[in-house]
């Protein structure tokens, strides 16, 4: 008689990443009998919720349910009905909601309340919605990429299964850029982590890790741009802001009330003699870079060395995976190749920013003008943050790998978050067992 395949004994999990600019739903799948093995969980679906981040719904919380419907329906379609009730759903909100909470804890709670009520209406096992800390965001991002790269596996392989594997067990650092915050997380080399707030201790698969992490709130690409505009308008002589971070010929009117809406611009707030100002692009990388550097306070450091704003940063060590907006922006600019040196990236950015706006619009007709107009700033900001903020050099640039997906799963904090909450990363190395008897019939 012929062997019959048993029905797939698999489990599913759902994590919603409620970021500052958008929400994404991720569906993960793994073999039920291999929960504690490293590298068995993989992403089967990403559904990007259509619209802005949840913090934008603060004045219309009753509409959050509609906003989430489409992707939750997608999850209902992808996951077999028999598995719905045992599939956990987690929602983690990041820096956009941290900023809203700084403005009003009550409003942030109201948004999360409605999110919880909406997600509870689905047939899944809803486990809660919460604002995760910047430290968690950094840590879970680090766990995700190292899990996917097979760094926690004790079995050494003579072949490489992933593009960035250096066939050793040294972990990768994680660089995450969002719209409202940015995180840097890595294992320093025999270095004391001088500031306790930045120190994490993990025991994973029988090995101890002393990890450094920091999340810079207000230094995501969108909030950094608001900061830069608020800083520059202080010294503008009238309501025209000639801005080197936008293409020549680009024009946009900004409301002062919008500029000062975010807590990130409070330190630059002043009474201006106008309600609106006009950005006029002049497209100059060097001047843009200089303007961005003024957002990083490097004059004060109470430790042996700092990143910026008095935040401890140990010497960089090993390879780094740069994901989220680090990847999306560099991918758009066609700068993700391992072969592109830092000097070449700078050169390309100079050319890109200098291109006239009309030319850019023609070349990228399919891209929304709001996004398109900000790539010069975002690319320049990434270079400034990595080089001056985190102290990468032209030589260490080659240790940065711009990563979108690893083995088909998105790089980001969501997988690490789910692995942790479902207890799928054991502290000790699981005993290696022969093939499970359920593998064959």
């Amino acid at each position: 008689t012929q062997n019959k395949a048993l029905p797939e004994n698999v489990k599913y999990g759902i994590v919603l990443d409620a970021g500052s600019s958008h929400t994404s739903l991720y569906i993960y799948k793994w073999p039920a009998e291999k929960e504690n093995d490293t590298g068995v969980v993989h992403q089967v679906e990403e559904c990007r919720v259509k619209g802005p981040g949840i913090s934008k719904f603060v004045q219309k919380v009753n509409e959050i349910g509609i906003y989430l419907t489409d992707c939750m329906e997608r999850a209902r379609e992808v996951i077999p009905r028999s598995q719905h009730q045992e599939t956990p759903v987690y929602l983690g909100a990041t820096a956009g909601m941290r900023l809203l909470r700084m403005e009003s804890e009550e409003l942030a709670d109201r948004v999360l309340d409605v999110v919880e009520r909406s997600l509870s209406n689905y047939p899944f096992d809803f486990q809660g919605a919460r604002i995760i800390t910047g430290q968690e965001e950094g840590a879970y991002g680090w766990i995700t990429i190292n899990y996917l790269l097979g760094k926690f596996s004790q079995k050494t392989r003579w072949f490489s299964i992933v593009p960035y594997e250096t066939n050793n067990q040294e972990t990768f650092g994680a660089l995450d850029l969002g719209g409202a915050s940015t995180q840097v997380t890595f294992v320093p080399q025999n270095q004391t982590i001088e500031s306790p707030d930045n120190a994490l201790q993990f025991r994973l698969y029988g090995k101890d890790y002393n990890v450094y992490t920091h999340s810079f709130l207000c230094y995501g690409k969108d909030q950094a741009l608001w900061q830069k505009l608020a800083k520059d308008i202080q010294v503008a002589s009238n309501e025209i802001l000639r801005d080197p971070c936008f293409h020549p010929g680009y024009k946009k009117v900004v409301n002062v009330s919008d500029l000062y809406k975010t807590p990130c611009t409070k330190r630059f707030e002043m009474t201006l003699p106008f309600q609106q100002f006009e950005i006029q692009g002049i497209g100059n990388y060097q001047q843009c870079h200089q303007s961005i550097l003024e957002l990083f306070n490097t004059s004060y450091c109470p430790y042996s060395q700092c990143a910026f704003n008095g935040i401890f940063l140990p010497p960089l060590q090993g390879d780094f995976g740069a994901f989220s907006a680090f990847y999306f922006v560099m991918k758009f600019l066609n700068l993700t190749s391992e072969k592109v040196s830092q000097e070449k990236v700078t050169e390309m950015m100079k050319k890109f920013c200098a291109q006239p706006w009309e030319e850019i619009k023609t070349s990228y007709a399919g891209v929304k003008e709001k996004y398109l107009s900000e790539y010069c700033f975002s690319g320049t900001y990434i270079l400034s943050l990595l080089l001056q903020g985190y102290h990468f050099t032209a030589d260490s640039w080659e240790h940065i790998h711009f990563i979108g997906k690893i083995q088909g799963s998105d790089a980001g904090w969501t997988l690490g978050y789910m692995l942790n909450l479902t207890n799928m990363i054991p502290a000790e190395q699981p005993l290696s067992t022969p093939l499970s008897h359920s593998t064959y019939v």
Epitope: K50, G51, K368
Partner: antibody, heavy 121, light 106 residues
Framework: EVQLLQSGAEVVKPGATVKISCKVS????????LNWVKQPNGKNLEWIGN????????RYNQKFKGRFTITIDQSINTAYMQLNSLRSEDTAVYYC??????????????WGQGTLLTVSS | EIVLTQSPAILSPSPGERVTLTCSAS?????MHWFQQKPGKPPRLWIY???NLASGIPARFSGSGSGTEYTLTISRMESEDFAVYYC?????????FGQGTKLEIK
């Protein structure tokens, strides 16, 4: 502002194939699902299916699965719907449309002007 | 699929009259959307998420309901309101429309 421009009216014979286009502008193409709706001579509206340009994933109403295919060409911001093995009951106005929340969380819903398809021998 | 049944199919109100259109769903939906359509034109979103007026829609229109029963109300009928009104649910796939209520001039 968001605009959806559909291809012109078509008169085709039963059994033939037709491809209707919907060119969108005024927003980032990958930001919203693009839906197709059928309306036979001013009667009921029927949802055919949609495509998510971000992932390329499609969904169909079971009733239209098989002969109807929704695709996109991201490079020219255009969605298509191909109808195969046409029958007289496919005669209708076909609309493309999209809906969702903009960057300021304002809800919007936009439709193309419609493409009249006549299937006749 | 969720079947939406609108009633009445046709209504002939006089200007100034209060008009109520109903939409019943075969199973519970979270929200209902309403569209207005005039001859030769695509449908236009009129009310979204049960009770929110779309941009530019006059305040004499309102929407309410929950679960399986939803209504669109016009407090005082005006001549420009004569059209066909459709309800639509977007809570689950396939998306479905009601068969429409036609408001016609007597």
């Amino acid at each position: 502002e968001v605009q959806l421009l559909q291809s012109g009216a078509e008169v085709v014979k039963p059994g033939a194939t037709v491809k209707i286009s919907c060119k969108v502008s005024g927003y980032s193409f990958t930001d919203y699902n693009l839906n197709w709706v059928k309306q036979p001579n001013g009667k009921n509206l029927e949802w055919i299916g949609n495509i998510d340009p971000y992932s390329g994933g499609t969904r169909y109403n079971q009733k239209f699965k098989g002969r109807f295919t929704i695709t996109i060409d991201q490079s020219i911001n255009t969605a298509y719907m191909q109808l195969n093995s046409l029958r007289s009951e496919d005669t209708a106005v076909y609309y493309c449309g999209l809906y969702g929340y903009d960057d300021d969380a304002n809800y919007f819903d936009d439709w193309g002007q419609g493409t009249l398809l006549t299937v006749s021998s | 699929e969720i079947v939406l049944t609108q009633s009445p199919a046709i209504l002939s109100p006089s200007p100034g009259e209060r008009v109520t259109l109903t939409c019943s769903a075969s199973s519970s939906v979270s929200y209902m959307h309403w569209f207005q359509q005039k001859p030769g034109k695509p449908p236009r979103l009129w009310i979204y998420a049960t009770s929110n007026l779309a941009s530019g829609i006059p305040a004499r229109f309102s929407g309410s309901g929950s679960g399986t029963e939803y209504t669109l109300t016009i407090s005082r009928m005006e001549s420009e309101d004569f059209a066909v009104y459709y309800c639509q649910q977007r809570s689950s796939y396939p998306l479905t429309f009601g068969q429409g209520t036609k408001l016609e001039i007597k």
